[in-house]
């Protein structure tokens, strides 16, 4: 399987909500001996490899935010810890995997990484990640709502989380 980032850059005004999304595609084993681990974290664009470093998102670690399920099952972080920090990660039946961040501040700007790991009995992990940039802006130059720029050279799109 692979991970695609639908958008490589999100530009949002302060105070807005945003949902960052990755999509898992390709063959996904739904057997009883396979589990999927999905999570989000902040990182930096390393000279060698992006997403190596795992920094917390609003003080929550990649382990605090992880989802754990089989195949393309739906799941979400329902625990209070994430929600108290204005965060929720979710995964649907179609391979979409997202994190919603509420009430954005300038401190939320940076590189965000999604990590998907296939864990299989007696086999090494299959690890894939995606990266995207979030820019939170303030002042007269800030957009009125979030604008997402596709990973390819398509048109930008206005997107705002509910």
């Amino acid at each position: 399987f692979k991970v695609a980032t639908l958008y490589s850059l999100y530009v949002c005004p302060e105070g807005q909500n945003v949902t960052l999304t990755c999509r898992v595609f390709g063959p996904v084993d739904k057997g009883h001996d396979v589990t999927f681990y999905k999570t989000w974290y902040r990182s930096s664009r390393g000279e060698v490899q992006t997403c190596s470093e795992r920094r917390p998102i609003r003080n929550l670690t990649f382990q605090d935010l992880h989802l754990h399920h089989g195949g393309h099952q739906a799941a979400n972080t329902s625990h209070d810890l994430a929600q108290r920090h204005g965060l929720e990660s979710a995964s649907d039946h179609h391979g979409n995997f997202s994190i919603t961040m509420r009430n954005l501040t300038l401190l939320d700007s940076g590189l965000y990484c999604c990590l998907v790991v296939e864990i299989r009995h007696h086999h090494s992990e299959h690890r894939v990640h995606g990266a995207m940039e979030l820019q939170v802006q303030t002042g007269k130059d800030a957009p009125s709502s979030c604008v997402a720029y596709p990973s390819s050279s398509q048109e930008s799109e206005n997107i705002t989380a509910a």
């Epitope: 999570t39 060698v48 470093e53 382990q63 754990h68 864990i119």
Partner: antibody, heavy 119, light 107 residues
């Protein structure tokens, strides 16, 4: 603060079974997203990974030891166990239990316990 | 199995020195490499993960670099508490394997 504590007999006779227990405190051994592993270190030598057990019960063993090793978990006691059959003097080592998150290295270790194989 | 080869196997240095230890994997492991410090009669302690990321609480004088097959651990200015044995470990694939260790001694 997570703490790992290995326990078990310090002396095992050749051909017998080495049995060790790792007791976890300050966290749940059944928490998803973690592996519980065993690593050993013969006196004066380097580190050797023995095997790991994932929170959902999947096991992973070093091929060099696979025929002799069993790692299991007892969630009710918050413990992880190692059994190594048919030991020889070459199995004399300090045995460590350690935890590692998914797609990460060993970030929490027990203090280790010395097991000597001798008749 | 992926073999991990460290060099040198031992090293003498003085407080304040800059020290570099290298680790080579027998096949590519991307950035899935960790460095540990071990003092006598103690468990190893994780210093670096993902080849170059500092584990929480580790002093910034420690740094790691490399990707693929060649990696380095650098201590920018040796402190008395840094004299220990250092191990690299690949966690790219099972079985996880360690380097043979580098013993850092006081000159």
């Amino acid at each position: 603060q997570l703490q790992l504590q290995e326990s078990g007999p310090g002396l095992v006779k050749p051909s017998e079974t080495l049995s060790l227990t790792c007791t976890v405190s300050g966290g749940s051994i059944s928490s998803s997203g973690y592996y519980w592993g065993w690593i050993r270190q013969p006196p004066g030598k380097g580190l050797e990974w023995i095997g790991s057990l994932y929170s959902s019960g999947y096991t992973y063993y070093n091929p060099s030891l696979k025929s002799r090793v069993t790692i299991s978990v007892d969630t009710s006691k918050n413990q992880c166990s190692l059994k190594l059959n048919s030991v020889t003097t070459a199995d004399t080592a300090v045995y460590y239990c350690a935890r590692h998150p998914v797609a990460m290295n060993f970030d929490d270790w027990g203090q280790g316990t010395l097991v000597t194989v001798s008749s | 199995d992926i073999q991990m080869t460290q060099s040198p196997s031992s090293l003498s240095a003085s407080v304040g020195d800059r020290v570099t230890i290298t680790c080579r994997a027998s096949q590519g492991i991307s950035s899935w490499l960790a460095w540990y410090q071990q003092k006598p009669e103690k468990a190893p302690k994780s210093l670096i993960y993902a080849a170059s990321s500092l584990q929480s609480g580790v002093p910034s004088r420690f740094s790691g670099s490399g990707s693929g097959t060649d990696f380095t651990l650098t201590i920018s200015s040796l402190q008395p508490e840094d004299f220990a044995t250092y191990y690299c470990q690949q966690y790219n694939s099972y079985p996880y394997t360690f380097g043979q260790g580098t013993k850092l001694e006081i000159k």
